[in-house]
Interface confidence: low
């Protein structure tokens, strides 16, 4: 009589996280009598996954009806696979006894779990920076397996090269994390720009995951000021305008000073937007010349986004 063989036909099985894994096992004989058990790992520390005879294994179902007469298929399906389920699974035939004794083991099936990386999260600097400055962006993605992963950085579709990437942990693990820091030089045209972190992994079937950061949340473009005197609107009245150009974000407060004394303060409201995303704004001041004996120094002082004020002055000649 030929001795019972335990056949595990698959040396390895690769499953995506969340899927069910089917682990195949057939025996060539019904003798000896005794249950099939499935273990993860070998040796004294092996973990019981399924016991045909007893126990409650909510994630495990048998592919065939194991209680059916003459059943020799003891393949199991393990539901909702996670990276923690990775390992080598052994189908083991036990011989009836008290206790049951191990009779023969299959060669084992190595289960590897393909876990998708989490959506990359891109974060920028805590404080805004001005053009020509270099800022750092970080990108993080977690929970992927296997370890091999590719991360790229882009700014407006152009690949960046100045970045450093680490995959942790260095040794074997059920899942891994990636952390990358990229350096980006800001330009005045970056209000509409995006920084994109792209992660490619075997689980993504050629469709990389992307995380984005809008440079509008990072950049501060300081305004340029121009103060001009308009033609006299009425006798003894001069209109002076302060053009505030190319600033971002919109948060801006303007103060007019006459000979160093505050005349009026206003907040930018009805701004116009430039194609590059920056804003322009204009404020004007009507100066009653007859109220002044001497020349008047008019100053347009602008506080932008909480930064130290910048100003531009204009000397208004008062004829004797």
């Amino acid at each position: 009589e030929e001795e019972l063989q335990v056949i595990q036909p698959d040396k390895s099985v690769s499953v995506a996280a969340g899927e069910s894994a089917i682990l195949h096992c057939t025996v060539t004989s019904l003798i000896p009598v005794g249950p099939i058990q499935w273990f993860r790992g070998a040796g004294p520390a092996r973990e019981l996954i399924y016991n045909q005879k007893e126990g409650h294994f909510p994630r495990v179902t048998t592919v065939s009806e194991s209680t059916k007469r003459e059943n020799m298929d003891f393949s199991i399906s393990i539901s909702n696979i996670t990276p923690a389920d990775a390992g080598t699974y052994y189908c083991v035939k036990f011989r009836k006894g008290s206790p049951d004794t191990e009779f023969k083991s299959g060669a084992g099936t190595e289960l590897s779990v393909r876990a998708k990386p989490s959506a990359p999260v891109v974060s920028g600097p805590a404080a805004r920076a001005t053009p020509q400055h270099t800022v750092s962006f970080t990108c993080e993605s977690h929970g992927f397996s296997p370890r091999d992963i590719t991360l790229k950085w882009f700014k407006n579709g152009n690949e960046l090269s100045d970045f450093q990437t680490n995959v942790d942990p260095v040794g074997e693990s059920v899942s891994y994390s990636i952390h990358s820091t990229a350096k980006v030089v800001l330009t005045r045209e970056d209000v509409h720009s995006q920084v994109i972190c792209e992660v490619a992994h075997v689980t993504l079937q050629g469709d990389p995951l992307r995380g984005t950061a809008n440079l509008s949340e990072t950049i501060r473009v300081p305004p340029t000021l121009e103060v001009t005197q308009q033609p006299v609107r009425a006798e003894n009245q001069v209109n002076v305008t302060c053009q505030v150009r190319k600033f971002y974000p919109q948060r801006l407060q303007l103060t007019w000073l006459e000979n160093g004394n505050v005349s009026r303060t206003e907040t930018a409201s009805t701004v116009t937007e430039n194609k590059d995303g920056t804003y322009n704004w204009m404020s004007w001041l009507l100066v009653n010349v007859s109220a002044h004996r001497d020349d008047v120094k008019l100053t347009c002082q602008v506080e932008h986004d909480g930064q130290p004020a910048v100003s531009k002055s204009h000397d208004l000649k008062v004829s004797a």
Partner: antibody, heavy 115, light 111 residues
């Protein structure tokens, strides 16, 4: 809360058309928008989903010919190289499937591809 | 791609009847529960009834229920109402993002 499609109409085979789907009462920023079509007298057919950011995906038959995009208030479906079998009512719906089901639907816009 | 097979394709029933529609996926749906049911009336857009196989959508009467896991799913209407005469579609999603397929539909008509 509603979605309103527009842009449908008669187009010749090989032509192009861009459908719009305007949202009111909610922002599309944090939602996927899916396009579903229904040929006259036929069942529903998933076309594709425009996710958050730059992520989009399409039914295998739609890849290459159909391209989706969206802003916070409007989603678009650009259709090229149209064929007579693309004749259908096109619906947009909020959602990306699974735990984000298609819960709000537009009224549909009819696209007729004929010479 | 995942294939969703609905049965029956049509049925005739009376008000008050219990109606069951099944939907079978060619492979396990994503997470074993990526299955939604939609109702469509003539000239109207579809309406979400059930998602995640068994979760009732907001505002949907409790006479609608969904069950099933993996590849086999069921929509049950416990007591058919006049407004329930419509076509019902299941929508299943595979493990790939770009793998969402509707069943062919089940038309529920007045007997």
């Amino acid at each position: 809360r509603q979605l309103v499609e527009s842009g449908g109409g008669l187009v010749q085979p090989g032509g192009s058309l861009r459908l719009s789907c305007a949202a009111s009462g909610f922002s599309l920023s944090s939602h996927g928008i899916s396009w579903v079509r229904q040929a006259p007298g036929k069942g529903l057919e998933w076309v594709g989903t425009i996710g958050t950011g730059v992520i989009t995906y399409y039914a295998s038959w739609a890849k290459g010919r159909f391209t989706g995009s969206k802003t916070s208030s409007t989603a678009y479906l650009q259709m090229t190289s149209l064929r007579s079998e693309d004749t259908a009512v096109y619906y947009c719906a909020r959602g990306s499937a699974w735990n984000d089901p298609f819960d709000y639907w537009g009224q549909g816009t009819l696209v007729t591809v004929s010479s | 791609d995942i294939v969703m097979t609905q049965s029956p394709s049509s049925l005739s029933a009376s008000v008050g009847d219990r109606v069951t529609i099944t939907c079978q996926a060619s492979q396990s749906v994503y997470g074993n529960n990526d299955l939604a049911w939609y109702q469509q009336k003539p000239g109207q857009a579809p309406k979400l009834l059930i998602y995640l196989a068994s979760t009732l959508a907001t505002g949907v009467p409790s006479r609608f229920s969904g069950s099933g896991s993996g590849t086999d799913f069921t929509l049950t209407i416990s007591s058919l109402q006049p407004e329930d005469f419509a076509t019902y579609y299941c929508l299943g999603g595979g493990d790939d993002e770009a793998d969402n397929t509707f069943g062919q539909g089940t038309k529920v008509e007045i007997k």
